[in-house]
């Protein structure tokens, strides 16, 4: 008689997960010398305890601990890039701008970006069928909270000025319901952090407005005043020639707006 | 929206050389294994050759050993086909896509999201 199985509304763990986690593991840690000294088998053995064999509605950020302590990992706390709905562009921004960091040029980040991973309460196995949805099944899934937990870290981490990319094609260019608007925002160091500097990127080339006098970007001026973090707003009218002046910036055409 | 774009084909003389490009938009090409694949007129697609992630393994078709070189930068997010001493039987069109782990298993690369790109053309002719 088969099993029965918790049919879940979000898509199963990601094919070949534990491999692909191992992989990216071994090339984080040859890439990046200050973290040579990490066994990638102790981080997988980390990683699917903190999931496996639990209820994929009753993860905690403390099951995660054990891999936390694994990746712990100093990055330039002046250098952290958030960025909320404008992942890719912050992420060729960061391929180019070698100093400074998203969460996923972390390792931890790097393992999980862009995978899907849950397991079954009192079996071992790895749930390649279906994995909970945020809003239709239930928000403490194990993917949900991994990245919560470490967008915490990220942010506490965070020192001077803080820089974060938003995306001006969207109806609410801050969304207090995403990873930054719920998680970041509030776990920025007003001790350390001086100065939240958001870039709003503009879609389209026509586009001249000034997305800074957005109301959603006010609201976001307001949170951060009143935890006593100076906030400044920039807008990126040309994010193309935003990356190619990042490449060349000895370019003449870089002297003007972007 | 996430695509790979070849390039770098064109008409050459046997024995000679091409240097075919493979570059990603919307997505990190860090996170993949990527192969190359190529269709010859009248035949079914098939993988020549596989990079993974960490660019430290290779792995090369029968039919292109010891004369194309794979390799990648994750910088430029591109990855390149070093083609040399190229046959009559080189000609086709040329794809690359991302496997869907991050490792070559031998050559049978199974491709992680099916939107092939269009190609680059190679034609070997005297």
């Known amino acids: 008689v088969p099993r029965w199985r918790q049919q879940w509304s979000g898509p199963g763990t990601t094919k070949r997960f534990p491999e692909t986690v191992l992989a990216r593991c071994v090339k984080y840690t040859e890439i990046h010398p200050e973290m040579r000294h990490v066994d990638c088998q102790s981080v997988w053995d980390a990683f699917k305890g903190a999931f496996i064999s639990k209820h994929p509605c009753n993860i905690t950020e403390e099951d995660y601990q054990p891999l936390m302590k694994l990746g712990t990992q100093t990055v330039p706390c002046n250098k952290i890039l958030l960025w909320s709905r404008i992942k890719d562009l912050a992420h060729q921004f960061t391929q180019v701008q070698r100093d400074m960091f998203t969460l996923e040029d972390t390792l931890l980040g790097y393992l999980a970006d862009d995978l899907t991973w849950c397991g079954e309460f009192n079996t071992s196995k790895i749930n390649y069928q279906s994995c909970p949805d945020w809003r239709k099944d239930c928000s403490n899934n194990p993917v949900s909270v991994f990245w919560k937990t470490v967008s915490r870290r990220f942010a506490e981490a965070a020192c001077d000025v803080v820089h974060v990319m938003l995306n001006g094609s969207r109806s609410k260019i801050f969304d207090k319901n995403s990873t930054f608007g719920s998680v970041e925002v509030h776990n920025l160091q007003p001790e350390k952090v001086q100065t939240l500097e958001a870039w709003v990127i503009h879609g389209g080339r026509e586009d001249s407005r000034d997305l800074c006098q957005d109301p959603t970007i006010k609201e976001l001026e307001s949170i951060i005043s009143k935890r006593n973090i100076q906030f400044s707003c920039k807008n990126i009218y040309r994010p193309d020639k935003f990356l190619q002046c990042v490449k060349n910036p000895e370019d003449s055409s870089c002297t003007s707006e972007i | 929206q996430v695509q790979l774009v070849e390039s770098g084909g064109g008409l050459v003389q046997p024995g000679g050389s091409l240097r075919l490009s493979c570059t990603a938009s919307g997505f990190r090409l860090d996170y993949y294994a990527i192969g190359w694949f190529r269709q010859a007129p009248g035949k079914e697609r098939e993988a020549i050759s596989c990079?993974?992630?960490?660019?430290?393994?290779?792995n090369y078709g029968d039919s292109v050993m010891g004369r194309f070189t794979i390799s990648r930068d994750d910088a430029k997010r591109t990855v390149y086909l070093q083609m040399n001493s190229l046959e009559a039987e080189d000609t086709g069109i040329y794809y690359c896509?991302?496997?869907?782990?991050?490792?070559?298993?031998?050559?049978?690369?199974?491709?992680?999201?099916?939107?092939w790109g269009q190609g680059t053309q190679v034609t070997v002719s005297p």
């Open positions: 896509a991302p496997a869907q782990y991050a490792a070559c298993s031998a050559l049978g690369v199974k491709v992680s999201f099916t939107s």
């Open positions: 990079i993974d992630i960490t660019g430290m393994h290779t």
